[in-house]
Each structure stands twice: as C-alpha cells, then as structure tokens.
Amino acid sequence: AITEAREEAKPYPLFPGPLPGSLQTDHTSLLSLPHTSGYQPALMFSPTQPGRPYTGNVAIPRVTSAGSKLLPPLAFKHTVGHIILSEHKDVKFNCSISVPNIYQDTTISWWKDGKELLGAHHAITQFYPDDEVTAIIASFSITSVQRSDNGSYICKMKINNEEIVSDPIYIEVQGLPHFTKQPESMNVTRNTAFNLTCQAVGPPEPVNIFWVQNSSRVNEQPEKSPSVLTVPGLTEMAVFSCEAHNDKGLTVSKGVQINIKAIPSPPTEVSIHNSTAHSILISWVPGFDGYSPFRNCSVQVKEVDPLSNGSVMIFNTSASPHMYQIKQLQALANYSIGVSCMNEIGWSAVSPWILASTTEGAPSVAPLNVTVFLNESRDNVDIRWMKPLTKRQAGELVGYRISHVWQSAGISKELLEEVGQNNSRAQISVQVHNATCTVRIAAVTKGGVGPFSDPVKIFIPAHGWVDHAPSSTPAPGNADPVLII
C-alpha cells in the first residue's frame, strides 16, 4: 500500500475529500524527523506489517562479528510513499535504515527518476549508533519546490558489494495550470473559419479551458485541455485568449490579435530617380499590406498631351524592390505615373499621380545624300550631306559626327570628327594613299548620336593619279556605293 501525504483536500470535481489512507496534514511537520535522537515514528514502517521493517530490496549479512549467528536482512524502513504539495512550498523527506555495527563506511545516495542527485542538493545523513546497530537517517529537503522537482526519489546504500534500494517517494508538485500551447496571432480572410489551439497541464489535473473573444466567454462550460476553438469567421479584428482552470486556480494565456486581411493601402511617395529619352526610373513607398503579403505591383503611365488618345500603359512588376524602370517611352514627352500593388485579397487604389518627363532623344534618321570627293591638290577628302528631317522629340541639332575608316593592305584605322550644326560639308585630310576611305555621318543632339548614314567609299590612289569623280550615298535599295574611277 502507498501511504500518501496530502497538503490539502481536493474540492469537487476532483475528489470530494481526503482519499482513504491518505494523510491530511502540513507537509513539513509530517515529513521531518528529529535529528537529535534515534526515535523513529511508526510512519517509517510498512503499514501492511506494523512494527516490521519493509523487506523489498535487502542485503543479507552472513554472520555477526562473533561469527556465530545470522543477522536479519538489511532493508530501508518504509516511509511516506506520495507527497502532494503546492509550488513554492518547502518539503523534506527521508529514508532510514538500521545497520549492524560490523559494517563500516556506509553511505547513502539519493536518486531521482533513475539519476543520482549530486552537488547542490540539501541531503543530510545522520547516524545514531547503539550497541549493536546504527540507525541511519538520510534526509532530503527542497526549498520552494517547482514543477521540475516532480518525480520519484529513492535512497541507495552499498554494503558488502550489495545495493539496498528504498521504496520510491513520489513528489507531486501542484500549481496553477501551465500552458504548453497558446493561441497564436493570425491574419485571416474575412468570414472564413479558422482554428485556435490552447493546451495547459497541471498537476493537478484535470485542466479545463474557457475561450475568451473580445472579453466575452465563447464556451459557457469548461472544455478539457487541449481545446481547439473553431472560430466561425470574423468581420473585424478580434482579440482571443484562453483561461486554464484547475483546482489550484486560473491561468490566463496571452491575448492574441486576429486581423482581417484586406486590400493594401495605396503606395505613397512615388518619386523619379532618373529620366532618359525613353525611360524613367521610379520608386515608391509601399502602403500598409492589409495583413497579407504583397504579390506584385502595377505601374500605370499616361501621356500628358492634349493630342494623345489618353490611353494608359500598364507595366507589371514584382512588389520588391520598390523600384521600376519604365521603358519604351517617347522622348521629350510628359507623363503622369501612378502605382498600385496587390495582395491575395486584391489591388490597392492607385497612388497619387506624379508628373515626369523624358529628356531629348537622339535623332532617329541619318543625314541624307552623303557625297565624297577627293581633292588631290589639297590632299583632302571633301564630304557633303543634307540635314536630316528630325522629329521634335529628338531635340535641337547640335552637330554631326563623321566616321572615316582607312583601309589598305590589311590595315584599318577609324577616325571620328565632330562638326557644328550649321555645316553641311566637311574636309578631312587624306590619311593613307593607295587605300579605301569609308565615310559615314550621324546627326547629334543633346539626346545623343543618331544612326549613321550608309557607308560611302572612295579610293585614294597613290600620288600622281588624277580622279575627281565623287562617291555618294546611293538611292534607297541600291547596293553599297563604290567609287567609279
């Protein structure tokens, strides 16, 4: 039989009163033993055989010191088997054994749940010698018990290479419920059911759960732990917690906020970082995500021009980074730009629109009617062309770039010349004789260099050859121009 010491009676619904055979008393007075004498209370003996030592795990000494008669078997005396107490209280329990004086150097060790307790534990062993035997009392005390002190404690004594083991003493530390699982904050879809979980443990058991939503109890009756609450859907943010109850009282979980997913707020602070003739680099600050991660964003671009058809160009981009290079724009044009982002619920409204402009573009056409003459007397090549018909967006013509490539006997050399916008002719020095000179011309604006004209080739003879025939840009569709000598 297990003798059980209880700190207090359990009210309904666990137990209606003290258990049969239990000891209803203050734990410290029950379990302390006097240290000043060898007195041992009856509690230390087995309740099944009053006055007889417990003989569960024994060592049998063979003879007395006189070598004549057998000694009784050695065993720890039976003690209290189960101690129930509240967290933060102090407890003291002990083992006792009477050992014939023939044995020397007997030591008692304490074990908890199969592991020896070493170091900073309050274990005291006291010896009470008599004529033939020594009573040994090993006390173990714990101050301010915690749940981690729960377990089965035993004494062990080594004697003559035999191990004597006491009956276990079960320590049950009771306290308020302890949460092993609490509800977690969540972001949920409007009017969609979801689950919350709450789990708490004792001892004492049972632990009962009440759910609380926005300060109102969800379940009128307690539910056994663990409990899963299926929330049937929310239309607005709510705060949930759970109460765990046992006979010691109540513990309340953390309150968790459940948010309702919504469309994001519009982005703010759309800014222009860089403009070129055909692209604009923008950035924005994302709005509130509506409790659901952004999926992507949409950049909307409208041309601000009374003559434009007012159509909107839409460029889809990832939500991060919060930047986008808008391409394929007209040069020297004004645009209105807005940004919208989406999450799983839908698209945000568009950000406040901002105005942005592209810069001048490079010319889109090459100079026309390029002709090339050899002026042998001056050792020059004369080049003439007609100004290209550039669009307004290309900006103002600032000049021309002339590329002339000299090729002879496997050697090739390209040279570039810049001339002003008022010119439509240029002269370049002959670089190499007995060579071919290939000329191309491009118009230049602040926006950049336009396309080069089709190449015009002229052969530069060795000194003494006379030839003034021009080379010129062919009419569209003709083959590459060549010098006709």
Epitope: Y12, N219, E220, Q221, P232, G233
Partner: antibody, heavy 118, light 106 residues
Framework: QVQLVQSGSELKKPGASVKVSCKAS????????VHWVRQAPGQGLEWMGW????????TYAQGFTGRFVFSLDTSVSTAYLQISSLKAEDTAVYYC???????????WGQGTLVTVSS | EIVLTQSPATLSLSPGERATLSCRAS?????MHWYQQKPGQAPRPLIY???NLASGIPARFSGSGSGTSYTLTISSPEPEDFAVYYC?????????FGGGTKVEIK
C-alpha cells in the same frame, strides 16, 4: 442522435409550483449547458437563463430570479425548471435547449405548456 | 442588456420573392444566430454565428452583418419558409432574442 425530451403540459392554480423536466440523450450531458426559454402565448422568445451541467451552477436572466430554479440530476442526464408561487402571467410554453459555443442553441426540446389558471 | 430590434414585424411576400429580414442591436455584438419557428413547434436553428447555415438548412437562406446590423436573406422563399424568424445575439449576458419577424404569404 441528440434529443431533448420535455415533460408534458401542466395545468396549475395560482400559488402552486411546477417542475418541468428536460431529459437529454445522444451526447455527454456534462459537456453542454442547458438553456431555458419562455414563450408566452402569441409572444416572442424570452431567454430565462441557463445551467452549467458540469458544475451545476445556474445563471438567471433579470426577471427570472427568486421564483425560478434550475437544477440537475446528472445521473439521469436531466435538467429541471421549477417555478414556485405561480402567477397567471407565468402561463407560457417553456423550452429547454442545448447550448454550445457562442451561446448558440443547437437542439431544442419540444416545449412544455404550463397553464396557470384558477 | 443588449436589445435586439427586428424589422419589419411582418413581411408579406409572394413565393419566390426575395425576403430581407433585419436585426439591429443596441450595441455591437460579436455574432448573431437566427431561428425559425412555425406555429405549435419549437424553434429550429437556422443560422449560426452570423453566416453559417445550420445542418439541413437549404442554401436559399443566408446571413450577413457585423457590429450592430445583421440581415437574414431568403433568396427565393418556398411555401414552407413562411414562419416567424428570431435573431439571438452572442456577446454579452443576458443572451437576448429579437422580437421576431413574421414572414407571411401575400
């Protein structure tokens, strides 16, 4: 299947007492509260209160304290409504209903008509 | 206590004509439940927690709302839907019912 079966109609004189029973079956009685609802002739539903079947603790709505008593016999999974010092205005159909989360009454008894007349 | 006001008190409809029943609370509530009652019968659960159909309830019934304003809709009433409908709030004690809306055949 879940069922709540109420006792039969009662005809009582003013000042007398009546005890209406509500026997539950098809579920664990102690897991769900029992609500009581009154409906006077030609009137709407009026919540009287409920009893916690786990602890036996009753909760009464305003206007239903004093003469009205909710009780249990868990051994037979039965809830009771007792009304003492009956008055003519207590004439009504009394319903019991099983309460679940969010105070929703998912199963109802068939109702017990209590008539108070001299 | 939270007072629930149902409107209209009576709704006269032809079968198939959409029915919209309103339940207003004197202060914000978490959920609204709806029950149907026919003469001589116990109330029957209809909608749980604002918008969830009770078992066996046909899809022509739907519930919506939040805060202080809740609605029960019968998209195309059948002859068996003509009855009295009650709302009941969950938020605070005491649990209160609305006064009921009678849906009758025009």
């Amino acid at each position: 299947q879940v069922q709540l079966v109420q006792s039969g109609s009662e005809l009582k004189k003013p000042g007398a007492s009546v005890k209406v029973s509500c026997k539950a079956s098809g579920y664990t009685f102690a897991n769900y509260g029992v609500h009581w609802v009154r409906q006077a002739p030609g009137q709407g539903l009026e919540w009287m209160g409920w009893i916690n079947t786990y602890q036996g603790e009753p909760t009464y709505a305003q206007g239903f304290t004093g003469r009205f008593v909710f009780s249990l016999d868990t051994s037979v999974s039965t809830a009771y409504l007792q009304i003492s010092s009956l008055k003519a205005e207590d004439t009504a159909v009394y319903y019991c209903a099983r309460g679940v989360r969010y105070a929703y009454m998912d199963y109802w008894g068939q109702g017990t008509l209590v008539t108070v007349s001299s | 206590e939270i007072v629930l006001t149902q409107s209209p008190a009576t709704l006269s409809l032809s079968p198939g004509e959409r029915a919209t029943l309103s339940c207003r609370a004197s202060s914000s509530v978490g959920y609204m439940h709806w029950y149907q009652q026919k003469p001589g019968q116990a109330p029957r659960p209809l909608i749980y927690a604002t918008s969830n159909l009770a078992s066996g309830i046909p899809a022509r019934f739907s519930g919506s709302g939040s805060g202080t304003s809740y609605t029960l809709t019968i998209s195309s009433p059948e002859p068996e839907d003509f009855a009295v409908y009650y709302c009941q709030q969950w938020s605070s004690n005491p649990r209160t019912f609305g006064g009921g809306t009678k849906v009758e055949i025009k």
